[in-house]
Amino acid sequence: ARNGDHCPLGPGRCCRLHTVRASLEDLGWADWVLSPREVQVTMCIGACPSQFRAANMHAQIKTSLHRLKPDTVPAPCCVPASYNPMVLIQKTDTGVSLQTYDDLLAKDCHCI
Amino acid sequence: ARNGDHCPLGPGRCCRLHTVRASLEDLGWADWVLSPREVQVTMCIGACPSQFRAANMHAQIKTSLHRLKPDTVPAPCCVPASYNPMVLIQKTDTGVSLQTYDDLLAKDCHCI
């Protein structure tokens, strides 16, 4: 169960979807991808305070134990809950192909 | 594709499964769980250096962009790749029940 969406740290500080513009060179793809030349990469960034967007029971446990043992147990982490597919025009041995990747762009985020 | 399992930071420093002993009180479960009194919580802890146990393409992108923009893009994070189920004897309005939880104990870990 997705828990509270209210960020106690202030607007935009907690785990949410961000867009980062990146070139093929930035991504290290220039040698095998032809297009797009630039990608609007959606990724999950932000803090995961107590019970904020807790993905599951494990995240809730992690929050509790982090409170008790902050040096041993890290806080939950902001990661993709699901992905949007994306196509790349990529080089092959014989030319090019259009390839779909299902795990490239974050669609929404949760804490785990 | 799960990438390299060699930790460049030294043995045990990178993302892996850890066991943390926790009481019902530690977990905040004392008011609704009867048994077990103590749980061996398995969780994912450790650093995620470049391409170490990268869960998918998104994790690889995150590594590349973190290297370029460390203040904007965080490094990948060590999270469960799968879970082991666990049963709890929990209090109900009428007595107790045996309930299985599928998302409580980490089974193995990856970086995302």
Partner: antibody, heavy 118, light 107 residues
Framework: QVTLKESGPGILQPSQTLSLTCSFS??????????VGWIRQPSGKGLEWLAH???????YFNTALKSRLTISKDTSNNQVFLKIASVDTADSATYYC??????????WGQGTSVTVSS | DIVMTQSHKFMSTSVGDRVSITCKAS??????VAWYQQKPGQSPKFLIY???YRYTGVPDRFTGSGSGTDFTFTISSVQAEDLAVYYC?????????FGGGTKLEIK
């Protein structure tokens, strides 16, 4: 596998609006980088690109025809629509829709024939 | 708009011959030219991307080259099934534009 199929009225009269539908399967218009384009071909002549629409709803049009063209999509039903206003006999052609991945048009429909006649 | 010109409307060749079709852009399009094949009664088929990259499944007898304004599409050994019209298209900028087509006839 990827398939596209165009449908239209077949025959219509000058000054009417031509409405075309492209129904497709095997890909999704919610995928980053994917679009659907419309191209036409008058009988015995060459290809003319008309318009395309992207996954993010960005739209591009043939310069000469821009004022008469409308393109839209229904992502959940895998359909793209093209409307051409105020048709005349010069709009008689076979109309194709094609799947696009960025600047590749790799799969084309079989085409639908449109005749404008009074 | 960028104008794509295929100077030969028709080209005649024999099975086994090498044939080259040219296409000229009205301005520099870098390598952003695609080639399509349209057989009689069929829809166009995508062959070449970005001047020289063969698309998945396209036989290796089909090649493309060129950059800037001058582009060439070559069939190294013509087969009977290559009877078709071949179109170049610039994908450098919208509006995308096609050449007028070159009809390959088999002697």
């Amino acid at each position: 596998q990827v398939t596209l199929k165009e449908s239209g009225p077949g025959i219509l009269q000058p000054s009417q609006t031509l409405s075309l539908t492209c129904s497709f399967s095997g890909f999704s218009l919610s995928t980053y980088g994917i679009g659907v384009g419309w191209i036409r071909q008058p009988s015995g002549k060459g290809l003319e690109w008309l318009a395309h629409i992207w996954w993010n709803n960005n739209k591009y049009f043939n310069t000469a025809l821009k004022s008469r063209l409308t393109i839209s999509k229904d992502t959940s039903n895998n359909q793209v629509f093209l409307k051409i206003a105020s048709v005349d006999t010069a709009d008689s052609a076979t109309y194709y829709c094609a799947r696009m991945g960025y600047d590749i048009m790799d799969y084309w429909g079989q085409g639908t024939s449109v005749t404008v006649s009074s | 708009d960028i104008v794509m010109t295929q100077s030969h409307k028709f080209m005649s060749t024999s099975v086994g011959d090498r044939v080259s079709i040219t296409c000229k852009a009205s301005q520099d399009v870098n390598t952003a030219v695609a080639w399509y094949q349209q057989k009689p009664g069929q829809s166009p088929k995508f062959l070449i991307y970005s001047s020289s990259y063969r698309y998945t499944g396209v036989p290796d007898r089909f090649t493309g080259s060129g950059s800037g304004t001058d582009f060439t599409f070559t069939i190294s050994s013509v087969q009977a099934e290559d009877l078709a019209v071949y179109y170049c298209q610039q994908h450098y900028s919208t509006p995308w534009t096609f050449g007028g087509g070159t009809k390959l006839e088999i002697k």
